[in-house]
């Protein structure tokens, strides 16, 4: 079944390559294990960026060696990327899974376009 | 809903400064970036800069660059727009937006700049 | 920086259909571009009526659509009503900024 998920259209990172974004659910019903994904379009290829499950007033875990980080607030997840360099400048979509209890529920946003600058080499300093 | 509701009508005189509030209400302020557009008298939109309150990472047009601070107030959700050097072809009014999937628009602050 | 250009002006009859367009100097205009069309009425602030292409606002009228046509992107308006004689300028977003076209006047005729 769908679902609308909100987000927003663009947003910067920070000279550190780190870059956060809200993904927002219309939940149908009530759900206590949600997935959130995060995938990243490019030249019209999408690969998945991190992926974490939680449960409902808990906070998101992703994998260890993940570059990503959340919090989850009712129908919202914050969402931080870190280590981005301008290369993965692109199209970051968000995608959210009622897993449990049933109906499965899943909702992909329209993604959020981050923009990333690589930021200019520190001078020698004598 | 959504509302973005700027502060009144400010007076200046060439070279002081004007600072010009956009409180907003209905969503995630820290989730989507603030842009700031001026529309002096009988003219089109012209695009300031944005800011990004999360991280307060801000983007500001060449041409305001050096002359222009946004700052955020996440506490408040409210968004500042501060324009010094002001001259006489800096009136116009000034509005806060948020340009996105679905877009807003506050209601706007005229500044008059005369001596 | 890019130039983002609107026609300056465009005149429709009542109920009728028109199309206005937003085009880039750097190449075809993308859903990257997330193209927004914004209404400007005189004495009034702009109000928004699509986002991201063809993301219309809950107060856009059903008559509005928003589209990429010919490499642009297009506002059109079917069925055209007195009320919609207005300034429409859209704005295109390029990786880390907005720009404005400098607008369209429509011209309902009576």
């Known amino acids: 079944k769908a679902m609308h998920v909100a987000q927003p259209a663009v947003v910067l990172a920070n000279s550190r390559g780190t870059a956060s974004f809200v993904c927002e659910y219309a939940s149908p019903g009530k759900a206590t294990e949600v997935r959130v994904t995060v995938l990243r379009q490019a030249d019209s290829q999408v690969t998945e960026v991190c992926a974490a499950t939680y449960m409902m007033g808990n906070e998101l875990t992703f994998l260890d060696d993940s570059i990503c980080t959340g919090t989850s607030s009712g129908n919202q997840v914050n969402l931080t990327i870190q280590g981005l360099r301008a290369m993965d400048t692109g199209l970051y979509i968000c995608k959210v899974e009622l897993m449990y209890p049933p109906p499965y529920y899943m909702g992909i946003g329209n993604g959020t376009q981050i923009y990333v600058i690589d930021p200019e080499p520190c001078p020698d300093s004598d | 809903q959504v509302q973005l509701v700027e502060s009144g009508a400010e007076v200046k005189k060439p070279g002081a400064s004007v600072k010009v509030s956009c409180k907003a209400s209905g969503y995630s302020f820290t989730g989507y970036t603030m842009n700031w557009v001026r529309q002096a008298p009988g003219q089109g939109l012209e695009w300031i800069g944005l800011?990004?309150?999360?991280?307060?990472?801000?983007n500001y047009a060449q041409k305001f660059q050096g002359r222009v601070t946004f700052t955020v107030d996440t506490s408040i959700s409210t968004a500042y727009m501060e324009l010094s050097r002001l001259r006489s072809d800096d009136t116009g009014v000034y509005f806060c937006?948020?340009?996105?999937?679905?877009?807003?628009w506050g209601q706007g602050t005229l500044v008059t700049v005369s001596a | 920086q890019a130039v983002v250009t609107q026609e300056p002006s465009l005149t429709v009859s009542p109920g009728g259909t028109v199309t206005l367009t937003c085009g880039s100097s750097?190449?075809?205009?993308?859903?990257?571009?997330?193209p927004n069309w914004v209404q400007q009425k005189p004495g009034q602030a702009p109000r928004s009526l699509i986002g991201?292409?063809?993301n219309k606002a809950s107060w856009t009228p059903a008559r509005f659509s928003g589209s990429l046509l010919g490499g642009k992107a297009a506002l059109t308006i079917s069925g055209a009503q007195p009320e919609d004689e207005a300034e429409y300028y859209c704005?295109?977003?390029?990786?880390?900024?907005?720009?404005f076209g400098g607008g369209t006047k429509l011209t309902v005729l009576r």
């Open positions: 704005a295109l977003w390029y990786s880390n900024h907005w720009v």
């Open positions: 937006a948020r340009l996105d999937y679905r877009s807003y």
């Open positions: 800011i990004n309150p999360y991280n307060n990472i801000t």
């Open positions: 750097t190449g075809a205009v993308t859903t990257s571009n997330f």
């Open positions: 991201g292409t063809n």
